[in-house]
Interface confidence: low
Amino acid sequence: VLPAKPENISCIFYYEENFTCTWSPEKEASYTWYKVKRTYSYGYKSDICSTDNSTRGNHASCSFLPPTITNPDNYTIQVEAQNADGIMKSDITYWNLDAIMKIEPPEIFSVKSVLGIKRMLQIKWIRPVLAPHSSTLKYTLRFRTINSAYWMEVNFTKEDIDRDETYNLTELQAFTEYVMTLRCAPAESMFWSGWSQEKVGTTEEEAPYGLDLWRVLKPAMVDGRRPVQLMWKKATGAPVLEKALGYNIWYFPENNTNLTETVNTTNQTHELYLGGKTYWVYVVSYNSLGESPVATLRIPALNEKTFQCIEAMQACLTQDQLVVEWQSSAPEVDTWMVEWFPDVDSEPSSFSWESVSQARNWTIQKDELKPLWCYNISVYPVLRDRVGQPYSTQAYVQEGIPSAGPVTQADSIGVKTVTITWKEIPKSKRNGFIKNYTIFYQAEDGKEFSKTVNSNILQYRLESLTRRTSYSLQVMASTNAGGTNGTKINFKTLSISHHHHHHHHHH
């Protein structure tokens, strides 16, 4: 059987290295070898590239090497396939070297901001050594912020030769790290170089972008003053690297700017002690280049009635997120403040908050919250400068079994009854929502019994016990992940009730 006719001939000119053609089929049923016939020097010369019978039979690729690689030039290529039964020739294909030239990648050697020019990086690189001196090169510059996976691209051409090249990349984010990589090709070529080694550069810093501002209102003190914990952070969308030198706060009672107080701090939180009236609070951040826009917050008067519009809220877990959704009776409210912090017996050490706009749900990655910790989550409706009543819920991103069981005691021991009481497990040891308690009790050398009660019950009366019998008992607290037994206690039912005992004495 004759070999298949070579098809899909594809050639590429690796500048100053080789001219390589490939074709299909790559494998023949029977042993086949190939000849590649070339005409070059615009048709004045011809030669042959053969695949080596011994080592490279059936290998659908062949390379022509210097010094017979002429450039610029037009080549014709025809591939002959031969086996024991005969020869099959391909169609003749035509190749303009300028259109199929592939060169080495350029090399970026500098990525830096230019003093005084904002949101720009100047990229400098060296043209590949192996690139035709006379040709215009086209370039693709790929760039992304350092913590993004999404590449952006810009295309341009350069005609300069034999010098370090420059490109100014504009309209970037301020004070942000960017990753750059560059590729090039002769302007007429369909083949691009590989990508250069990635390099990183940082745009110039600017005055801070802005602040998100929030507060926690605490109960009024005995002297009538109200502690208000102010907190602020870089606004959503601010450059990751942005740093403030400090923050200026000023505040005054509504309609009385004469009583303005000012504070300067380098912290991102500050406690104010306010009177009972409505107050206005303003915060700006600043660095060596200027101030951010002003963040404003209204602190309501002590006796002000706040609106309520959240009717229900659900927290649910997906594969890797905690999603909180809420329903509202006020369609005009489109901004919400979400607070979350660990529910611990002491003052919470970490308090987090985030603004949500144009949505009635909030999502957080599970790995941002600690497993086995209960979180209090509150959502406040915000309508212009007014903050409404919060709606709160609790959630665990991962439950475990309690790290301790309930501490239990036996009270009111009778002939056939006993009352068991136990203490709630401390919050730090629950590791999940306590679903229920199970009382396990067993008479000496007897069968074990159990009784399960709801999590809001901390006392239970066991009945139908056997008189004058020793029992062992423990209470297990269970979460969705499983249960943990508390301390084991022992008690003995009475032989005769106290009531009968006393009565007997009277006789």
Epitope: E107, I108, F109, S110, V111, K112, V114, L115, I126, R163, D164, Q197, K199, V200, G201, T202
Partner: antibody, heavy 119, light 107 residues
């Protein structure tokens, strides 16, 4: 502490080669370029070339092209400069320097290695 | 190659005075100029980068200015410790080149 420590002084015969090492501590040379500069006695600074240790790419001043060879071993955090066909005019202190492409300046220099060529 | 020409080649200044060193590039190097000081037996030390940015820890008595082809290093209120040879260097285009150096002497 961020520093570059170079190998000790060398005495070579004309026509021989010399290889100077430059070992970095406190940073990874893969994240920088290492440049080499020489200074003849009583003279100014003369740029030899540079290497990107991340990929081995080099760039040489035309006057050193073909005679200087820059290499780097990222496993030992060390860069090397080899100069061949030594002659009397190569007597100089050879410095390596770190050039960090983000800030674009030579901020850390080696202590220098004196190379003497004498028959 | 870009030639960096420094003037003067030597300079003698009394303590408290201002010293100025000029550096001229044979073609525009935008602001890609660095200034170093070298004391006898020591490696060069970075003073100014990108023509006008003071390197960390360099006293504010040192300032750089200029762009394109003309650059200046100024040392105000000169102190005895400021002696040494000062070099400008361009990293606009390779091969990177240095000025010949200016020797500053304190009277």
């Amino acid at each position: 502490e961020v520093q570059l420590v170079q190998s000790g002084a060398e005495v070579k015969k004309p026509g021989a080669s010399v290889k100077v090492s430059c070992t970095a501590s406190g940073f990874n040379i893969k994240n920088t370029f290492i440049h080499w500069v020489r200074q003849a006695p009583g003279a100014g600074l003369d740029w030899i070339g540079r290497i990107d240790p991340a990929n081995g790419n080099t760039k040489y001043a035309p006057k050193f092209q073909g005679r200087a060879t820059l290499t780097a071993d990222t496993s030992t955090n060390t860069a090397y400069m080899q100069l061949s066909s030594l002659r009397a005019g190569d007597i100089a202190v050879y410095y390596c320097a770190r050039y960090y492409y983000v800030s674009s300046y030579f901020d850390v220099w080696g202590q220098g290695t004196l190379v003497t060529v004498s028959s | 190659d870009i030639v960096m020409t420094q003037t003067p080649l030597s300079l003698s200044v009394s303590p408290g005075e201002t010293a100025s060193i000029s550096c001229k590039a044979s073609q525009s190097v935008t602001n890609d100029v660095t200034w170093f000081r070298q004391k006898p037996g020591q490696s060069p030390k970075l003073l100014i980068y990108s023509a006008s940015n003071r390197y960390t820890g360099v006293p504010d008595r040192f300032s750089g200015s200029g762009s394109g082809t003309d650059f200046t290093l100024r040392i105000s209120t000169v102190e005895a410790d400021d002696t040494g040879v000062y070099y400008c260097q361009q990293d606009y285009s390779s091969p990177w080149t240095f000025g010949q150096g200016t020797k500053l002497e304190i009277k």
